[in-house]
Structure formats: structure tokens, C-alpha cells
Interface confidence: medium
């Protein structure tokens, strides 16, 4: 059964756009008027997880690629990667747990909680040139985003 | 408050097509999808199949040749064809409806029908 | 097809805690949800996304899941949770039932 799918190109709120700089790892930097599109575009699927005014499930899959970000634990700690997945079967509205974030919306700004891991956000460091990952909010790390809609 | 209710015929002979309606009352009907779900006497519950107000449909694999799931989106209703069936078949079917505010599950039931296939 | 098994029945004494297991491969995964069904009704949604608890449930009834197993609980059991419970969830696109746990309340 198909599935509503927005697409968007997410900012993190120093404004540094997300690339994909190998198959599956996604970083953060700044982007000038000759590589701005080098960002990526997410697809937005709205899924199965607990809706409230404040927070909306969503899987985040890469445009034109059979990747989502998913969320799994490695060596102890809560960890996002990018998931390889089977093209026939996703999206589905129903999404395995890892991939599911809860998108919560914070005045003009955006930030996505793992549903897996509470408290657990999509982060960008405030250097230059890091991967994105999982961070539970603390210290410098930036969990806001703003998100740009793209047309289908 | 949401209602289903549904109807169709409770007794059917071998190799007949059974089929069943739920009309929705009360609530948006788009919002949702729509399943329905059987269960033999004095067995479990067994997921037909689903679909959305656009007529997109998902079939469980067992029964997925045989079943047909059609709506009426003018009406609020929604329907189930079973083809070819046998006393197998017997059983009170539900429509029901799933909501994204729990999770996509279904949480509101009609009555049920009891369906029998005899010769 | 997935398959989820339940034991087929548990028993309890009043105001004891009752615990229905519900297992399948990779179970933890997805996201269970519980029906309760008394007899000659329709079954009515107790726990939904694993843990959450439909409005009008009572507080007595809880849910978890992890691993392979997804677990309803019912504690102060009463005479009026006497029912089959059903776990549910869901395989690729299509949905699962266990099948389903008589529960029996002592005395």
C-alpha cells in the first residue's frame, strides 16, 4: 500500500548542507553556489510509530538510492548508519523499529529522535567535514535542522 | 464515535464467492486503512487483507488468489470477495479499521459476521 | 510467512500478575501490539506499539518487547480479564496474529 513521501534537503542550523561522501556515510559542511548540489535529498516517508502534536514517525531514505538511515547498537552505544535496503519492499508504512524517527518540530527548527533509542538525535559536529551520527545532546553537538521542501 | 458495520450472506455452499461489506460511520475515511480479519470457530484471528480510500491493496499470501478488497468511497464502505470457497472457509469474518494514532493496528472492530460453507 | 506462538493458556489467581508471551523470529524488531477477546465479541485493541496503552485500558495492563519475545502483562489480575489474548504484528506488508492465549482467573 503506498505510502506518503515528501522530499526535502536538510540544513543543520550553522546551515552546513548533508553530502554523501562514500557509499554510506553521510557528512556535514559548508556548501558554496558551484557544489550546492552535491547535497542530499531525503525522501520522507510517514510510517508506523505514535503520532502526537509535537512529534511525527518518519523514515529518512536517500533520493534515488536504496539507502535509509537507520539506527543500531554498536559496541554499547546507540549508533546511525546508512542501510542498504531491498527496493521492492521499501518504504512500507510500517517500518522496521531502526529506521523509524520521531520528527519533532521546535519553533522554525527540525529534530529527529531515534524511536529505538529515546532521547538519541540525527547530529551534526560543529567542525567541518564530520559524519553525520546518533547524539544524545549534549555538549556542542547540533541536533536542529531546518528542512528546505523539494518538489517531487 | 466510530462504528463499522457490515453485512452479506451467512450461508454458502462449496465453490460459491462469499462476500461481505462494512459501511464506516463517523470519522474520516481517507485517513485510515481498511482490513478484514476471519476466525474459525473456536480458533485464532487470521488477516485477510487491507486498503487505503484510493483502492491500493495488500493481501495476506495464503489467501491472496482468491480475495478481492474493493471500496466505495462515496458510500464509506468497503468490501470482501472470497472466491472457490470451502468449509475452511467457515468462520465470523470482521472488518475493521486501522489508524495511524495507534500505529497503523486496528483498532476499531465491527460485529462480525458468521459465514458457513456447507453443501 | 512469520509465525507467532503464544502458549495456549495461562492461569492466574485474583490480584496475582499474569504475564502472556508471544515469540517470533526477530519479534523485538517490529512493533507488537495485544487484543483481548471475550467470548462472542470482537476482540478490543490493550497494548499497542509495545507498550502503549489504548485510552479506556486500565493501567494494570503493560507491554514489552525485545529479542524474539513480546510480553503483555496484567498485574491485580481480575475476574474480568478473563478473556483470550491475542499478540499481533506484522511480516514485510502483510499482518500476523499469534494464536492466541486463553487466560484463566482462579477462583
Known amino acids: 500500500v503506498p505510502i506518503r513521501q515528501l522530499h526535502y534537503r536538510l540544513r543543520d542550523e550553522q546551515q552546513k548542507s548533508l553530502v554523501l561522501s562514500d557509499p554510506y556515510e553521510l557528512k556535514a559542511l559548508h556548501l558554496n553556489g558551484q557544489n550546492i548540489n552535491q547535497q542530499v535529498i531525503f525522501s520522507m516517508s510517514f510510517v508506523q510509530g505514535e503520532p502526537s502534536n509535537d512529534k511525527i514517525p518518519v523514515a529518512l531514505g536517500l533520493k534515488g538510492k536504496n539507502l535509509y538511515l537507520s539506527c543500531v547498537m554498536k559496541d554499547g552505544t546507540p549508533t546511525l548508519q546508512l542501510e542498504s535496503v531491498d527496493p521492492k519492499q521499501y518504504p512500507k508504512k510500517k517500518m522496521e523499529k531502526r529506521f523509524v524517527f520521531n520528527k519533532i518540530e521546535v519553533k522554525s527548527k527540525v529534530e529527529f529522535e531515534s524511536a529505538e533509542f529515546p532521547n538519541w538525535y540525527i547530529s551534526t559536529s560543529q567542525a567541518e567535514h564530520k559524519p553525520v551520527f546518533l547524539g544524545n545532546n549534549s555538549g556542542q553537538d547540533i541536533i536542529d535542522f531546518t528542512m528546505e521542501s523539494v518538489s517531487s | 464515535q466510530v462504528q463499522l458495520q457490515q453485512w452479506g450472506a451467512g450461508l454458502l455452499k462449496p465453490s460459491e464467492t462469499l462476500s461481505l461489506t462494512c459501511a464506516v460511520y463517523?470519522?474520516?475515511?481517507?485517513?485510515?486503512?481498511w482490513s478484514w480479519i476471519r476466525q474459525p470457530p473456536g480458533k485464532g484471528l487470521e488477516w485477510i487483507g487491507e486498503i487505503d480510500h484510493s483502492g491500493s491493496t495488500n493481501y495476506n499470501p495464503s489467501l491472496k488468489s482468491r480475495v478481492t478488497i474493493s471500496v466505495d468511497t462515496s458510500r464509506n464502505q468497503f468490501s470482501l470477495s472470497l472466491s472457490s470457497v470451502t468449509a475452511a472457509d467457515t468462520a465470523v469474518y470482521y472488518c475493521?479499521?486501522?489508524?495511524?494514532?495507534?500505529?497503523?493496528?486496528?483498532?476499531?472492530w465491527g460485529q462480525g459476521t458468521l459465514v458457513t460453507v456447507s453443501s | 510467512q512469520s509465525v507467532l506462538t503464544q502458549p495456549p493458556s495461562v492461569s492466574v489467581s485474583p490480584g496475582q500478575t499474569a504475564s502472556i508471551t508471544c515469540s517470533g523470529d526477530?519479534?523485538?524488531?517490529?512493533?507488537a501490539f495485544w487484543y483481548q477477546q471475550k467470548p462472542g465479541q470482537s476482540p478490543v485493541l490493550v497494548i499497542y506499539l509495545d507498550n502503549k496503552r489504548p485510552s479506556g485500558i486500565p493501567e494494570r495492563f503493560s507491554g514489552s518487547n525485545s529479542g524474539n519475545t513480546a510480553t503483555l502483562t496484567i498485574s491485580g489480575t481480575q475476574a474480568l480479564d478473563e478473556a483470550d489474548y491475542y499478540c499481533?504484528?506484522?511480516?514485510?506488508?502483510?499482518?500476523?496474529f499469534g494464536g492466541g492465549t486463553k487466560l484463566t482467573v482462579l477462583g
Open positions: 463517523g470519522g474520516s475515511f481517507s485517513d485510515y486503512y
Open positions: 526477530k519479534l523485538g524488531d517490529k512493533f
Open positions: 475493521a479499521r486501522a489508524s495511524p494514532s495507534s500505529g497503523w493496528t486496528l483498532d476499531y
Open positions: 499481533y504484528a506484522w511480516d514485510n506488508a502483510y499482518e500476523v
